[in-house]
């Protein structure tokens, strides 16, 4: 299972549910579905209030039981460490894969934290982070922001990933904007 890590804004916008949580148990494998689930303790929800409705407490996260079919394996044994988890809802259950955005909260830049808590949502409706994987690449729409981090360094560690969001400048136009300047 291979996938290019997405820009955090893309992860936020494409996910049904974005939460902050601690992994508090060892994985359990369901003997019918062959999915494994991790027990989590959710501390914050950033996206998914409407999708979840009244069932606003997520206690488990589900993933395939094998890496080759994109199963996520949680390596940290620190049960007090908080993680940002962006996943999909299937039958009311939170599902993630190795391609999902799952990162220690403390590893996120202040700008990314701001993005997840407040700003990324502003760009979801109209704007698209467009990955530039090889030169030359050009914008296909005014609402696209060219994401070039992969050309220069690891995509998650790039400047655009860590500090910028693709946000509307005016109708029909999106541009990279600094999340730093928006931090109160």
């Amino acid at each position: 299972c291979t996938c290019v890590p997405p820009h955090p804004q893309t992860a936020f916008c494409n996910s049904d549910l974005v939460i902050r949580a601690k992994f508090v148990g060892t994985p359990e494998v369901n003997q019918t579905t062959l999915y494994q689930r991790y027990e989590i303790k959710m501390t914050k929800m950033y996206k998914g209030f409407q999708a979840l409705g009244d069932a606003a407490d997520i206690r488990f996260v589900y993933t395939p039981a094998m890496e080759s079919v994109c199963g996520y394996f949680h390596r940290s044994h620190n049960r007090s460490e908080e993680f940002l988890i962006a996943g999909k809802l299937q039958d009311g259950l939170l599902h993630i894969t190795t391609c999902s955005f799952v990162a220690p909260w403390n590893s996120l830049s202040l700008a990314q934290r701001r993005g997840f808590t407040k700003t990324y949502t502003v760009g979801c409706e109209e704007c698209t982070v467009f990955p530039c994987l090889s030169i030359p690449c050009k914008l296909q729409s005014g609402t696209h922001c060219l994401w070039t981090d992969q050309l220069l360094q690891g995509s998650e560690k790039g400047f655009q990933s860590r500090h910028l969001a693709c946000l509307p400048r005016e109708p029909g136009l999106c541009t990279w904007q600094s999340l730093r300047s928006q931090i109160a």
């Epitope: 060892t26 994985p27 359990e28 019918t32 094998m66 890496e67 080759s68």
Partner: antibody, heavy 113, light 111 residues
Framework: QVQLVESGGGLVQPGGSLRLSCAAS????????MSWVRQAPGKGLEWVSA????????YYADSVKGRFTISRDNSKNTLYLQMNSLRAEDTAVYYC??????WGQGTLVTVSS | DIALTQPASVSGSPGQSITISCTGT?????????VSWYQQHPGKAPKLMIY???NRPSGVSNRFSGSKSGNTASLTISGLQAEDEADYYC??????????FGGGTKLTVLG
Amino acid sequence: QVQLVESGGGLVQPGGSLRLSCAASGFTFSSYAMSWVRQAPGKGLEWVSAISGSGGSTYYADSVKGRFTISRDNSKNTLYLQMNSLRAEDTAVYYCARFFDYWGQGTLVTVSS
Amino acid sequence: DIALTQPASVSGSPGQSITISCTGTSSDVGGYNYVSWYQQHPGKAPKLMIYDVSNRPSGVSNRFSGSKSGNTASLTISGLQAEDEADYYCQSYDYQQFTVFGGGTKLTVLG
């Protein structure tokens, strides 16, 4: 009581195909994931493949990926293993297992020219 | 291509206790509470003796017990009997390979 009965083993030439079946009884078949495990003569156990209760998720060992296909027919309470492009190293007793708690008696597959 | 390491053989006299170890990694034994132990007599199918590290299926003698510490699981057989002579295999879930077995341990009951 839980019963698993494998069939379909036999002698086949390298490059040939074989389809194993496992008839299950004594439990709600669709509620359990099923697996195939094999044991080469005088060797240890090797997991081959697994399938979820609905058949929607399938997993394979690297050694058989692309050559073997696991499937199930819940209406017939039967598990299958379609084996293509067989090699000498696939020679083994093949066991079907209910999520590893109950095992059949096995069926011998011999790949030889 | 064996992921879990077991001693090739162990032996003990009737009435004694023996322990078989099963060493893996944090992606299998250490990462899950899913270690099983199987007993296999020659020409027979494996029989589940312990599941989920330390649980015994109904019908299995309480002389068999399992435990785990870190990346190593153990099967202990107390009050060894002649019919315990068999091959024993450990198994664990593994997120890379779904499930893995140990290479097997031949238990010989002396005398």
